[in-house]
Structure formats: structure tokens, C-alpha cells
């Protein structure tokens, strides 16, 4: 009878040896599996935010490209009706150009010296922003904001003049005070031969390897081409 | 007060990459230009890399045009120089510097340097 | 580009000296200059702007002239904070380019 209970004593040790040892590797097989749904929960999370993130841009991008497309639809529209109309003066600018009165103006976003720029004006048949009004001058101000942007003034060659041969003495005027100084003392050989305007607006001269802004403008006719 | 922290540094293999950030506080980050200059074991300063207050302009020094590129997070207050395939003669401390203006003006404020090692 | 001498390239100076740098410019940079003092191990503090201009908080014992091609900086009196690495730079045009620097030592 002793022997018998001792047999089954040692079964039930051996059983619940074996259900300990088996509850012991689920645990252990659901905690790994936990963490791996944990990890891969927050890699989701992760993902799921990047997502958002990225067509939250793409959205941006998007409302921009739109945008862009709208604005050079009607440009391209305004440029088709110049083309089958019978050569009268045309009303629009090319694409990127912004229109003002009778003219077109392209304002860069980089810096070069007045040279340069002048030159890149040139090779979009146009020239460096010749300025005849308050009214215009407001309108290039709102465009360049508070940078120092060249104009197409300059007096490289003795006296001040306009690139496009507008009269400087009886034209517009809006140098800051105590401008020009054509200072001379930057030993360049000359003195400070370009105008650019300042961060109000104002007009100075300054020497013309400094890399601003520059604003190029070319005339609303049928010849500037698009 | 005013502070630039460069962060980012680090020993590297030639030809392989790295990205250095500066982050920028005290002052309205957007409204300035900002540029990197670096400074070999020795040497004196060599001028890196501009990026224009509103990252419309950048221009860069002969010796890592083509390989380096400098960009700018405006809304985190961050400036970026991404280098890729580095040379020996990388190797320099690397200091973050804020423009006075909006990028062509002199340099007032500098970050502490990062240190960058190429080297096999 | 624009190249930058500096000269002399280092200096012994006592404490009450005065001492002056000098910055030549391969081509006439207006006053688009700047100077810089730099201690071991540290980074470059900003000390003149526009060849003349006092950067804030820098003390008026330094002091720069020139226009041009050619540049000085002067410290009026030397004090032991003062022994540093001087450099210029220009500003006029990309690339900004630094002088060689000169280092000022004690005597």
C-alpha cells in the first residue's frame, strides 16, 4: 500500500514537474511574443506617423504644384491668344515673370555681382530693373523685400546711367541720404559704381562684385518673347 | 543668449558620409544667413559654405563643391551640412557661424566645433 | 578668389604693448572686412566688422583702419587675454576667404 502511494507521488511530482516546466516555456514563448508585438506595434506607430508626415507634405507640394500650374496656365493662355491675335501689343509675361504696368519683372532668388547679373538679365532679352516711379519702386520694394537687390544703374563709365538709356538727371530718384557716395577708398580703381536698393528700399551704390539680389525687367510688347 | 551647438562629428572612412547639425537659439534664426568654416589640426580657418536666411542662396568653397551640401530647417531652428565622399583632408573642426545679414555680410556669432577625423 | 596676407605671422609682445596686424587683399575689398581672435581650443570670437566697426561687448583697445587692399588691426595696450590668434577676412565676395593668421606671444 506505502509503495503504491509512493508511486503515485512520484507521478504527480513528475507531472507537475512537466506542467511546471510547460507553463514555464508558454510564459516564456508569450513574453518574446509580446515584445516582439510590442516592437513591431511601435514600428507601426513609427510608420504610420512617417506616413502621415510624408503626405502631409506631399499635400503641401502638391496645393504648391497646383498652384504653379494655375498661375502658368494663365500665362500660357495669355501668350496663345498673343500668337493667334494679329500682332497687337501683347498683355502678358512669360512664365515665372510677374507683369506691372507695361512691363514684366523676374526677381532672382541667389546673388551675383552686378555683372552677372546684368548679363543673365540680358540672355532673358531683358535688363537690369530700370526704376521711373514711386509707384513702380513700391511694387519692385514689395517683390525684393528687406535684401539689397541690383538695379540698372550704374556709373562704371563716368557719369550715373540707366542700362536702357532712360535720362538719369530728370528721372526718378530715391538714393538714401548722403547717396551716392561713389566712395573711392575700396581701391577697385573706381569708386562704388553700382546701385542697389537697401533693405528699405532706399537706393545706394556699392561695389560691384557684391553678390545680391538683382531684378530684371523687360517690356509687355510682342518682341520679348516668352 | 544668443548660442550655436554643432553636433554630428565624428571619426569616418574615406569616401564614406556624414552630416553635421548646428542647433541655433537666442535669436530669429530665419532672418540670418548662416554658414560653416572649418579649421584643420594647425591650420587656420577656411571658409566652407553659405546658406542664404531663407535657403535660396548657397555657395560653397572650390575644395568641397560637389561633395558637401549645406541646408537649413528654418521652423526647428537647425542648419545642416551633409558631406559626403570625405577625404583626409577633411579632417577639421567644424564651426557653425551666424552671418550678420542675410548671408553676404560678416560673421558675429560661432558655435563651439564639432570634430570631424577621415581617416582609415 | 580673393587671397589674404597677414602679417607677421606670430608676434612677442610684453603686457602694455601696442600691437598692430596688418591684412593685405590681393584685390581692393572696399571695407568688407572683418577681424577675429581665436585662444587654444576655442572657437573664433568676432571682434571688428566693416575694417572698423566694434563688434558688442568687445573691448576699444582694438581697433581696425583701411580701406581697400590694405588693413590694420591694433590692440592699444596688451593684456594677458590678449595673447590669441588674430585673423581677417573678407567679405566682399564668395568665397570668403581668412588671412594665415597671426599668433601673438608673450615676451
Known amino acids: 500500500q506505502n509503495s503504491k502511494l509512493q508511486e503515485e507521488l512520484q507521478a504527480l511530482r513528475e507531472t507537475f514537474s512537466n506542467l511546471t516546466a510547460s507553463t514555464d516555456a508558454k510564459v516564456k514563448t508569450l513574453s518574446m511574443q509580446g515584445g516582439n508585438v510590442g516592437r513591431k506595434m511601435k514600428s507601426l506607430e513609427s510608420q504610420l506617423e512617417k506616413q502621415q508626415q510624408d503626405l502631409s507634405e506631399d499635400h503641401s507640394s502638391l496645393l504648391l504644384h497646383v498652384k504653379q500650374f494655375v498661375s502658368d496656365l494663365r500665362s500660357l493662355s495669355c501668350q496663345m491668344a498673343v500668337l493667334q491675335g494679329n500682332g497687337s501689343e501683347r498683355t502678358c509675361c512669360p512664365v515665372n515673370w510677374v507683369g506691372y504696368e507695361g512691363s514684366c519683372y523676374w526677381f532672382s532668388r541667389s546673388g551675383k555681382p552686378w555683372p552677372e547679373a546684368e548679363k543673365y538679365c540680358q540672355l532673358e532679352n531683358a535688363h537690369l530693373v530700370v526704376v521711373g516711379s514711386w509707384e513702380e519702386q513700391k511694387f519692385i520694394q514689395h517683390h525684393v523685400g528687406p535684401v539689397n537687390s541690383w538695379i540698372g544703374l550704374t556709373d562704371q563709365s563716368g557719369p550715373w546711367k540707366w542700362v536702357d538709356g532712360t535720362d538719369y538727371e530728370s528721372g526718378f530718384k530715391n538714393w538714401r541720404p548722403e547717396q551716392p557716395d561713389d566712395w573711392y577708398g575700396h581701391g577697385l580703381g573706381g569708386g562704388e559704381d553700382c546701385a542697389h536698393f537697401t533693405e528699405d528700399g532706399g537706393w545706394n551704390d556699392d561695389i560691384c562684385q557684391r553678390p545680391y539680389r538683382w531684378v530684371c525687367e523687360t517690356q509687355r510688347d510682342r518682341d520679348s518673347g516668352s | 543668449q544668443v548660442q550655436l551647438v554643432e553636433s554630428g562629428g565624428g571619426v569616418v572612412q574615406p569616401g564614406r558620409s556624414l552630416k553635421l547639425s548646428c542647433a541655433a537659439s537666442g535669436f530669429t534664426f530665419s532672418t540670418y544667413g548662416m554658414h560653416w568654416v572649418r579649421q584643420a589640426p594647425g591650420k587656420g580657418l577656411e571658409w566652407v559654405a553659405v546658406i542664404w536666411y531663407d535657403g535660396t542662396n548657397k555657395n560653397y568653397a572650390d575644395s568641397v563643391k560637389g561633395r558637401f551640401t549645406i541646408s537649413r530647417d528654418n521652423s526647428k531652428n537647425t542648419l545642416c551640412l551633409q558631406m559626403n565622399s570625405l577625404r583626409a583632408e577633411d579632417t577639421a573642426v567644424y564651426y557653425c557661424?551666424?552671418?550678420?545679414?542675410?548671408?553676404?555680410?560678416?560673421?558675429?556669432?560661432w558655435g563651439q566645433g564639432t570634430t570631424v577625423t577621415v581617416s582609415s | 578668389d580673393i587671397q589674404m596676407a597677414q602679417s607677421p605671422s606670430s608676434l612677442s609682445a610684453s603686457v602694455g604693448d601696442r600691437v598692430t596686424i596688418t591684412c593685405r587683399t590681393s584685390?581692393?575689398?572696399?571695407?568688407?572686412l572683418a577681424w577675429f581672435q581665436q585662444k587654444p581650443g576655442k572657437a573664433p570670437k568676432s571682434l571688428l566688422y566693416k575694417a572698423s566697426s566694434l563688434q558688442g561687448g568687445v573691448p576699444s583697445k582694438f581697433s581696425g583702419s583701411g580701406s581697400g587692399t590694405d588693413f590694420t588691426l591694433t590692440i592699444s595696450s596688451l593684456q594677458p587675454e590678449d595673447f590669441a590668434t588674430y585673423y581677417c577676412?573678407?567679405?566682399?565676395?564668395?568665397?570668403?576667404?581668412f588671412g594665415g593668421g597671426t599668433k601673438v606671444e608673450i615676451k
Open positions: 584685390q581692393g575689398i572696399g571695407k568688407y
Open positions: 557661424a551666424r552671418d550678420q545679414g542675410v548671408g553676404y555680410d560678416g560673421l558675429d556669432v
Open positions: 577676412q573678407q567679405y566682399m565676395t564668395y568665397p570668403l576667404t
